[in-house]
């Protein structure tokens, strides 16, 4: 029951922080214009990975695609490759963690299966949210170099007799949303690692002796361990986590039409 | 058409307070800023401030911030500009305009109120 | 505040001339963001209230004729009439759109010569 919960829970973190790193990844307030030097401003500027925007006092609200890729730094387009990257590593690992939820029947998919497919899931969304954390993190030294480099600069060139102030960015929004989303599918996939380990048939305690017998085979097991069909997957066993309660599948002793694929 | 007419003339003696009113029709009366500009005779163009109907958000200018104050009725798309503390420098014309919102230039003025301060 | 000067405070003309007004900002009017000088230019005619001619240093106001044209960047704009009409002969402001408090220059009064 408590890995049942333990992965669930684990899906549902990790759905909620991929779809923070989508939403991240989309929005246009990665940077916002730095307001502490120049706060009478009536024009407010911020930037996305995507495109940049300026909010006129107006309400009237501008924004312009990077049309170009060449002309874009480096580190802009790493920090787009790293969210992209986590974004298609967190949609596979959601797919792969739906096929490995306990609470859903696929077949007569057994629980190593599943525990390795929730091993694999919860690998992908360790790396998308290490993924997504490193591309907003990148983002945000590169904020800092910038803002340290403008107040340098901030007065220059105009022999002080007219003041031209460098505009200034700071951390936006999306900085906040892909930290936190990242560090919520980092948690999610730790929790399906966790789930897995429950999951997984312990080898040390598979203390089973197979007696063959004329007919067909039927393997005993020690308590705490039921007999399967000698269909398909014979050798596999199933462990029971709740003091004999058997699941819907557990009940299941001849074989089925799925046994045969 | 877009329309502003501002309330008729007034003449208020020193330390009084004024209410200039400036109706709006011919365009969603919630969707633009409303700016307040005056000119004193023979003199310049002088911002006061503006108001935003549909989240009654202000934006004074520093000089006139604590003697002004601008409100909105929505049901009749009315704007409001009160002055108190009047002072004989006070004495201009006072324009409602209208923000344009593909940018940031008032393109419709009320036709102006005149206010003399006088003792 | 932003001081927005303009220069001259008057210029007599004739119907037909070029006019040029200048407008000085104490501070950049150029928005960083989408390269846009937050510069507007109103005519004034007297007991009327004013009518905007351009916005964005140099975007006309649409019904305004082509003979009006802005130009500058940063700190120093232009208002240029091609050729002087009757109608034109009025008092020309400029006004700070990019920081609060807006604030207008004195302005420029187009006289007949």
């Known amino acids: 029951m408590a890995v049942t919960a333990c992965q669930g829970l684990g899906f549902v973190v990790s759905l909620i922080g991929i779809a923070g790193i989508i939403a991240a990844t989309c929005m246009d307030q990665w940077s916002t214009q730095d307001l502490y030097n120049n706060p009478v401003t009536a024009v407010f500027n911020y930037q996305g990975l995507w495109r940049s925007c300026v909010r006129e006092s107006s309400g009237f609200t501008e924004c312009r695609g990077y049309f170009t890729l060449l002309g874009l730094p480096a580190m802009l387009q790493a920090v787009r490759a790293l969210m992209i990257v986590g974004i298609v590593l967190g949609a596979i690992g959601l797919l792969v963690s739906i096929f490995a939820l306990k609470c859903i029947r696929i077949g007569s998919m057994e629980d190593s299966a599943k525990a390795n497919m929730t091993l694999t899931s919860g690998i992908m969304f360790i790396v998308s949210g290490l993924c997504a954390i490193a591309g907003v993190s990148v983002f945000a030294n590169m904020l800092v170099t910038n803002f340290w480099m403008s107040t340098a600069n901030m007065y220059t060139g105009m022999g002080g007799m007219v003041q031209t102030v460098q505009t200034r960015y700071t951390f936006g929004a999306a900085l906040f949303v892909g930290w936190v989303a990242g560090g919520l599918t980092l948690i999610g996939g730790v929790m399906m690692c966790i789930a897995c380990r429950g999951l997984a048939p312990e080898e040390t305690n598979y203390k089973a002796v197979s007696y063959h017998a004329s007919g067909h085979s039927v393997a005993y097991k020690p308590g705490g361990f039921k007999a399967s069909t000698g269909f398909g997957s014979n050798t596999k066993n199933k462990k029971i986590y709740d003091g004999g309660a058997r699941t819907e599948d557990e009940v299941q002793s001849y074989p089925s039409k799925h046994d045969y694929v | 058409q877009v329309q502003l007419v501002q309330s008729g003339a007034e003449v208020k003696k020193p330390g009084a307070s004024v209410k200039v009113s400036c109706k709006a029709s011919?365009?969603?009366?919630?969707?633009?800023?409303m700016h307040w500009v005056r000119q004193a005779p023979g003199q310049g163009l002088e911002w006061i401030g503006m108001?935003?109907?549909?989240?009654?958000?202000?934006n004074y200018n520093e000089k006139f911030k604590s003697r002004v104050t601008m409100t909105v009725d929505t049901s009749t798309s009315t704007a409001y500009m009160e002055l108190s503390s009047l002072r004989s420098e006070d004495t201009a014309v006072y324009y409602c305009?209208?923000?344009?919102?593909?940018?940031?230039?008032?393109?419709?003025w009320g036709q102006g109120t005149t206010v003399t301060v006088s003792s | 505040d932003i001081v927005m000067t303009q220069s001259p405070s008057s210029l007599s003309v004739s119907v037909g001339d070029r006019v040029t007004m200048t407008c000085k900002s104490s501070?950049?009017?150029?928005?960083?963001?989408?390269?846009?000088?937050?510069l507007t230019w109103y005519q004034q005619k007297p007991g009327q209230p004013p009518k905007l001619l351009i916005y964005w240093a140099s975007t006309r106001e649409s019904g305004v004729p082509d003979r009006f044209s802005g130009s500058g960047s940063g700190t120093d704009f232009t208002l240029t009439i091609s050729s002087v009409q009757p109608e034109d002969f009025a008092t020309y402001y400029c006004q700070n759109d990019y920081s609060y408090p807006f604030t207008f220059g004195g302005g420029t009064k187009l006289e007949i010569k």
């Open positions: 305009a209208r923000r344009y919102y593909g940018s940031i230039s008032p393109d419709y």
């Open positions: 501070q950049s009017l150029l928005n960083s963001g989408n390269q846009k000088n937050y």
């Open positions: 108001i935003h109907p549909n989240s009654g958000s202000t």
């Open positions: 011919g365009y969603t009366f919630t969707s633009y800023w």
